[in-house]
Interface confidence: low
């Protein structure tokens, strides 16, 4: 998953500014890049530490700029290193100046095991002294002086990976800052060979792509993608995926590749030479220009590209028909994803031709680990691969990358997965109140372990005893009434909180023990509440009779209608009244009891009643007489409530008369508000008065009522009241 | 570091309005409870006011005065005190709710005064 | 509404003494009361809560004690920045979230 390149610029050293950049494309590492000098490969190089900088123009880029005054602190071996998961992947470059009186061939010469190779120096200039060649630092090998040829060459019959290495030449009187290097890479494997016994078949690696020993994958060439390295990148691009962009006028002259091994240095395609600064010849394309085109039908051929296939035509050479390979793009893959930690399925899909198939969609872990489909479909014009990550935890938060590499191209997309820890209320929750059958719970919701914003929040609850199932309620306030429990029950209660998106559910937080009271008895029977005097009433009931032996009594609450004034009263059991005293003349209190043992018991309905007054009560009010005939008349009236009215009297006599002659209607009680008398006399005027009596007298009325009955003929009359003051 | 750093606070008239604002910082602003507690010159703590996920609740004395409300986006906790009158008068803190009070700001003086 | 009441309301004592301060609620309140000290001119800051677990960074020589209606806040050896006001605060019935009217703790 780590795309390492290592850019030597212009690797033969003049009085020019040079430079070494490793980048890191298309990957985000967790340890920074490295760039050292190979001591392995060269030992008695210069000592000088480097001076490592971003490279401003990428993000994941390192450089080290040596100014031409330097030239001569240059000369030796180098490497890029970067991490993931632990491992290190490390790519080696030379530097040598470009006066040495050797050159190599190339920079770097990869072989198979057991092939037949040889190391070629160029000698450029001449001198009266014997050649020397060393590997790593140290002799091997010596030609007189007489005998050096214009190629000076090492000749190894049957390569084995113990030879590889750095190679030097020299003339015997000079010294690192005058050699040429060339470094051998030997293949773990027999040509087209891999695997831990070499015993697997390589890919066929296109456009000189090599086969990686130990993963059996193509490392392509600068310019190539691809699983096979069959599709040429854009212009002037290079990496695994041709992200990355060769920002010179010239493309990528100049630029000398270094990819991890097996692979070595190269230059981009469509340049050769040491330095990468000379054109491919025409008919030639590729990495160092050694690639010939032979293409078909009269194709194009492009030194960047190799053929460039009519429409309906592809392969390396156009030699082949069919459908134009589309490189894979990966869709419907958002730049951020927020999971909960636990079970998560990642999906990647892609489209492309061919469409990518299973082995060829991968998934990698921000730690460089890489994940393979689990699951697989296509349909016409996508590929779905299913991933599964049996527990995604915080620390896997990070960049991921759908990555898809078909012979048509690669693709990566990196996205952003941020795993959140599920919430999980740190304290138990609280009850508040409970009763017989119900508990009033504060949840205490907060504060919480895990992230939130909580979606939703559910309260647990169950039976202690009983092997019931967990029941729950969805929540929405902090202050919850659970109902219908059963009473002398010990309950356990706990909270689950729920954050959004799937799997949101946290595990339930502390739990809370908590036992129902016993069912309360039913209140007292045939409550009555009377006013006893002034300043007491009389509440009584029937005895009570309770089913257990449990000791009970009567609690009587009773609080002022008029004033805020309650009092609780605690009555033995045996009693059956209480007389509620230290009260208000005049004035309403309501009163309601319950039995209580341990258990407290159910209120009755409140009762209502008046203390006897200290005053006089006020004369009735909207006194009416109506519905007159010639013998009858109704009258009616109303009375101010809190006076302890006990009867009202209603005194009559025809105008005129003695008052010893007046008639006395007594109405004994007080709720009637009209009365009709009867028997008088047609056409006479009658002088009506109205009282009301209470326990401390009668009213005194203002003025009289008068009443005229009609002629025994004529139909009822209302008299709105005329009045005579007496 | 926990930090909650109250602003709003002023000199006003009886009957007029100010709104508190808290800044909160160094821990995760919306999955607490915020609340505000004042303190009136010499006198003890009173809880004002305080907003729990959905839920707010209020001191009988501000109940229908006072407004408490948060900004998860940009971790600011409000009051909006409407109908100011003198007994309001005292230094405003606001405080990370847990049923008690973990941590608070500064505080910020609001005086009622004709 | 549930009242706290605190004693004493002013404690003189020297640095190295025993303090005492105690709150008592007018209800059953559980376990649920936290302590407050406040130094003059600044912020409360919390020191109990639970009624007995110490907040972060509160040192040792504070402790706290009881359940039901009464409760206890103990500084078993006081230094100079100890003296300051403490209060006490329930959470077991709100709204309202109600305080004690103070302890304040000065050097005899």
């Known amino acids: 998953a780590m795309d390492l390149i290592l850019i030597n610029s212009l690797p033969l050293v003049s009085d020019a500014e040079t430079s070494l950049t490793c980048i890191a494309s298309g990957w985000r590492p967790h340890e920074p890049i490295t760039i050292g000098r190979d001591f392995e490969a060269l030992m008695n190089q210069h000592q000088d530490p480097l001076e490592v900088t971003q490279d401003v123009t990428r993000e994941w880029a390192k450089k080290v700029v040596w100014k031409r005054e330097k030239a001569s602190k240059i000369n030796g071996a180098y490497f890029c290193e970067g991490r993931v998961r632990g491992e290190a992947i490390r790519i080696r470059t030379m530097k040598m100046r470009q006066q040495a009186s050797f050159l190599p061939a190339t920079l770097t010469m990869t072989v198979d095991k057991g092939d037949n190779v040889n190391i070629s120096f160029k000698k450029v200039l001449i001198k009266e002294e014997d050649a020397v060649i060393y590997k790593n630092g140290s002799f091997i090998h010596s030609v007189p002086r007489h005998e050096v040829p214009d190629i000076l060459e090492v000749h190894l019959p049957h390569a084995q990976p113990q030879d590889a290495g750095v190679y030097s030449a020299r003339y015997i009187g000079g010294n690192l800052f005058t050699s040429a290097f060339t470094r051998l890479i030997v293949r773990r494997c027999e040509a087209q060979k891999w695997g831990p016994e070499c015993n697997h078949l390589c890919t066929a690696c296109m456009n000189n792509g090599v086969c990686h020993e130990d993963t059996g994958e193509c490392i392509c060439p600068p310019g190539f993608m691809g699983r096979t390295c069959e599709k040429a990148c854009e212009l002037h691009t290079f990496g695994r995926t041709c992200k990355e962009r060769c920002s010179g006028q010239e493309g990528c002259k100049s630029y000398v590749f270094c990819l991890p091994d097996p692979y070595g240095c190269s230059c981009a395609t469509g340049w050769k030479g040491l330095q990468c600064n000379e054109a491919c010849h025409p008919g030639f394309y590729g990495p160092d220009c050694k690639l010939r085109c032979s293409c078909n039908n009269g194709e194009m051929c492009d030194r960047f590209q190799g053929c460039l296939c009519s429409p309906g035509w592809q392969g390396l050479q156009c030699e082949r028909e069919g459908i134009q390979r589309m490189t894979p793009k990966i869709v419907d893959l958002p730049d951020h994803i927020e999971v909960n930690s636990g079970k998560f399925n990642p999906i990647c899909k892609a489209s492309g031709w061919p469409l990518p198939t299973n082995e060829e969609m991968t998934l990698v872990k921000p730690d460089g680990t890489v994940l393979h489909p689990k699951d697989f479909n296509h349909t016409d014009h996508f590929s779905v691969a299913i991933f599964t990550i049996h527990r995604i935890l915080p620390p896997d938060s990070g960049v991921w990358v759908c990555s898809v590499n078909t012979v048509a191209g690669m693709v990566e997309k990196p996205f952003n997965i941020s795993v959140k820890v599920l919430p999980k209320p740190l304290n138990a929750p609280n009850v508040i109140d409970t009763g017989h059958n119900f508990a009033v719970i504060n949840i205490s919701s907060e504060p919480y372990f895990g992230d939130g914003p909580i979606k939703s929040k559910k309260l647990l609850y169950k039976p202690v005893n009983h092997y019931e199932a967990w029941q729950h309620i969805q929540v929405t306030n902090e202050i919850v009434t659970l109902n219908y429990l059963e009473p002398r029950t010990e309950y356990e209660l706990c909270v689950q909180l729920v954050r959004r998106g799937e799997g949101g559910e946290g595990h339930p937080g502390p739990v809370r023990r908590f036992t129902t009271a016993s069912i309360g008895l039913p209140p007292p029977r045939g409550l009555n509440l009377l006013p006893k005097s002034q300043t007491t009433l009389n509440l009584t009931w029937q005895p009570i009779f309770p089913s257990s032996e449990d000791d009970f009594y009567v609690e009587v609450e009773r609080r002022s209608v008029q004033k805020s004034d309650q009092q609780n009263i605690k009555v033995p059991g045996n009693l059956t009244s209480v007389l509620l005293n230290n009260l208000h003349p005049r004035e309403q209190y309501v009163v309601r009891a319950r039995v209580n043992t341990k258990a407290q018991g159910e209120w009755s309905e409140d009762l209502t009643a008046w203390t006897l007054s200290d005053i006089l009560p006020p004369q009735p009010e909207n006194i009416k007489i109506s519905n007159i005939t010639h013998s009858s008349a109704v009258i009616s009236w109303t009375i101010l409530d809190g006076y302890s009215i006990s009867s009202i009297t209603i005194r009559y006599k025809v105008q005129g008369k003695n008052e010893d002659q007046h008639v006395d209607v007594k109405i004994k009680n007080a709720t009637i508000t009209q009365y009709q008398l009867k028997g008088l006399e047609p056409e006479t005027a009658y002088q009506v008065d109205i009282f009301a009596e209470n326990n401390i007298g009668s009213s005194n009325p203002a003025f009289s009522h008068e009443l005229v009955t009609l002629p025994e003929s004529q139909a009822p009359a209302d008299l709105g009241g005329g009045k005579m003051l007496l | 570091d926990v930090q909650l750093v109250e602003s709003g606070g002023g000199v006003v008239r009886p009957g007029e309005s100010l709104t508190l604002s808290c800044v909160a910082s160094?821990?995760?602003?919306?999955?607490?409870?915020m609340s505000w507690v004042r303190q009136a010159p010499g006198e003890g703590l009173e809880w004002v006011s305080a907003i729990n996920g959905g839920s707010t609740f209020y001191a009988d004395s501000v109940k229908g005065r006072f407004t408490i409300s948060r900004d998860n986006s940009k971790n600011i906790l409000y009051l909006q005190m409407n109908s100011l009158r003198a007994e309001d008068t005292a230094i405003y803190y606001c405080?990370?709710?847990?049923?008690?009070?973990?941590?608070w700001g500064l505080g910020t003086l609001v005086t009622v005064s004709s | 509404e549930i009242v706290l009441t605190q004693s004493p309301g002013t404690l003189s004592l020297s640095p190295g003494e025993r303090a005492t301060l105690t709150c008592r609620a007018s209800?059953?309140?559980?376990?649920?009361v936290a302590w407050y000290q406040q130094r003059p001119g600044q912020a409360p800051r919390l020191i109990i809560y639970?009624?007995?677990n110490r907040a972060n960074d509160v040192p040792d020589r504070f402790s706290g004690s009881g359940s039901g209606t009464d409760f206890t806040l103990t500084i078993s050896s006081l230094e100079p920045e100890d003296f300051a006001i403490y209060y006490c605060q329930q959470y077991n019935n709100w709204p309202p979230l109600t305080f004690g009217g103070g302890t304040k703790v000065e050097i005899k």
């Open positions: 209800q059953h309140v559980n376990t649920h």
């Open positions: 405080a990370n709710w847990n049923s008690f009070f973990d941590y």
């Open positions: 160094g821990f995760t602003f919306s999955s607490y409870g």
């Open positions: 639970d009624a007995t």
